[in-house]
């Protein structure tokens, strides 16, 4: 014997939407199509986000923070789409949104939880402070607080300093590591668990090179296949450290395939570049060319730093003249 009617309790639809700071998102809501559609979107059950009824928007009572930032998919309403298009989300927009939809035959309420993440591309920097050498992994703006891990020669390092400054809506984080006197390779990973986004910085020190004056030097720079994806936009920069600061010798942009060279004695092999080999030559060496040379391959997902130390010694002729 079947009952005349039975009811299954279904909790209010609740969806999680993850947005990225300053980007546009859609808060989804659907309903069984019907006439006399009324749509009210509210934030935290208090603030009016968007109202639509009698065939048009009614935004007189809209909270000012949503002004010019919301719209519906007007051509889709008759098909049961009450989703909200939300422009330029900020961290203050995080929270619970309720969509009330009324028609001639029913009323439904959907809840959407909006979480907002920030992940401005991090950087890995190599710095000299007096006699010390530091690797610094930093991210200018990130939310929520990221997970930062360091590895030395692929082995996790427990020591992990984090300098954190919190602004109104995100964190700025620096994680320095003292690598003075080390020839190991280092890797720093910054992970934003909300956005499921990971960035990796890798630093490799090459063996020192000894060259004579007037000779040329070839410095290798090849990306590690684990990280490198040639389809992704990246930038390659060669720079030389002089008295604690780096000066850029040349750079290459994959998006435009442009090479800009600031040092006339520097040369890049176009064919090698096409094979993702960014090794460079420096001709006609002089004593002032001694120092550290840094190759930086960077994309949104990684930074690969390769450091070469070059010692230029006087040639026999020069020495005998002195």
């Amino acid at each position: 014997i079947f009952p005349l009617a039975f009811f299954i309790y279904v909790p209010m639809n609740e969806q999680i939407v993850i947005g990225r700071l300053d980007e546009d998102i859609i808060l989804p809501s659907s309903f069984e199509r019907g006439s006399e559609v009324v749509i009210h979107w509210k934030y935290q059950d208090s603030y009016k986000v968007h109202s639509y009824y009698k065939g048009s928007d009614h935004l007189e009572s809209q909270d000012p923070r949503y002004a010019n930032r919301t719209s519906l998919f007007y051509n889709e309403i008759q098909n049961g789409n009450a989703s909200l298009f939300f422009r330029r989300v900020s961290l203050l927009d995080e929270g619970i949104y309720t969509c009330y939809v009324g028609t001639a035959i029913q009323v439904i309420t959907n809840k959407v939880v909006l979480k907002v993440g920030v992940f401005l591309t991090p950087v890995m920097k190599y710095e000299k402070r007096n006699t010390n050498s530091f690797l610094i992994c930093s991210v200018l703006s990130v939310y929520p607080r990221p997970i930062i891990t360091w590895k030395m020669d692929n082995t996790p390092i427990s020591e992990n300093n984090m300098e954190e400054t919190g602004s109104l809506d995100s964190f700025s984080i620096n994680s320095p590591l003292n690598i003075t006197g080390s020839n190991s390779s280092y890797e720093c990973t910054i992970e934003n668990s909300l956005l499921k986004q990971t960035w990796t910085g890798r630093w490799t020190m090459k063996d020192g090179l000894h060259k004579m004056q007037s000779e040329h030097v070839s410095l290798s720079c090849q990306p590690v296949n684990d990280y490198f994806s040639p389809n992704q936009d990246f930038k390659v920069t060669w720079s030389r450290m002089k008295s604690g600061t780096f000066s850029v010798l040349a750079y290459y942009l994959s998006s435009s395939q442009n090479t800009i060279i600031n040092e006339s004695r520097f040369s890049w092999n176009k064919e090698l570049i096409n094979q993702s080999d960014f090794s460079m030559n420096l001709m006609d060496l002089n004593l002032s060319d001694s120092g550290e040379y840094l190759c930086n391959i960077s994309s949104d997902e990684y930074t690969l730093l390769t450091i070469h130390t070059v010692h230029v010694e006087p040639s026999q002729e020069t020495a005998s003249h002195n």
Partner: antibody, heavy 121, light 106 residues
Framework: QVQLVESGGGVVQPGRSLRLSCAAS????????LHWVRQAPGRGLEWVAV????????YYADSVKGRFTISRDNSKKSLYLQMNSLRAEDTAVYFC??????????????WGQGTLVTVSS | DIQMTQSPSTLSASVGDRVTITCRAS??????LAWYQQKPGKAPKLLIY???SLESGVPSRFSGSGSGTEFTLTISSLQPDDFATYYC????????FGQGTKLEIK
Amino acid sequence: QVQLVESGGGVVQPGRSLRLSCAASGFTFSDYGLHWVRQAPGRGLEWVAVIWYDGSEEYYADSVKGRFTISRDNSKKSLYLQMNSLRAEDTAVYFCARDRNSGALGYFPHWGQGTLVTVSS
Amino acid sequence: DIQMTQSPSTLSASVGDRVTITCRASQSINNWLAWYQQKPGKAPKLLIYKASSLESGVPSRFSGSGSGTEFTLTISSLQPDDFATYYCQQYNSYSTFGQGTKLEIK
């Protein structure tokens, strides 16, 4: 089925106050906007006020603005009309009516049976 | 405020007749118009909404038409139960009722 039952009517002197109630059943009270509509003896219908499903918006007819206040208690499934500074012309049967949905539309598929308010000295 | 004017005020008709009641708005109300039927001592009953949509459970002999400022309610074949007072209501801006049309037996 939807049921709306008004109460609180009676005879009151001009200038005095009265509070009407409307008890609802048979639907999810907090999903619907509610209105008060009145009808003077032998006369036509006059819309008085509306309150939205969530209590966020209230609107009034010019004839009662500043004197009447509509309110609701979703936990008690009740609608109220607080009537102050009553006048002879407020004499009418007061109906509680349910909006099609949120209160934003403004027409009434469901009505109560009404309660009579007489303002007389 | 939007004024609603109904005509006629009183209408005499017989069972089986086709009758039409007109409602005029003082300004355009698009199609945001409802029609109600009321019998003495009873609450009004919704017949038509959005000018021409028939409310669930209402007999198909009732129909509505019009948009802008001119609207009509038509009863295609009067039944004994249809003798009552009919009101139009605009809900484009808040709400206003017409003064009513009393439909009586001829």
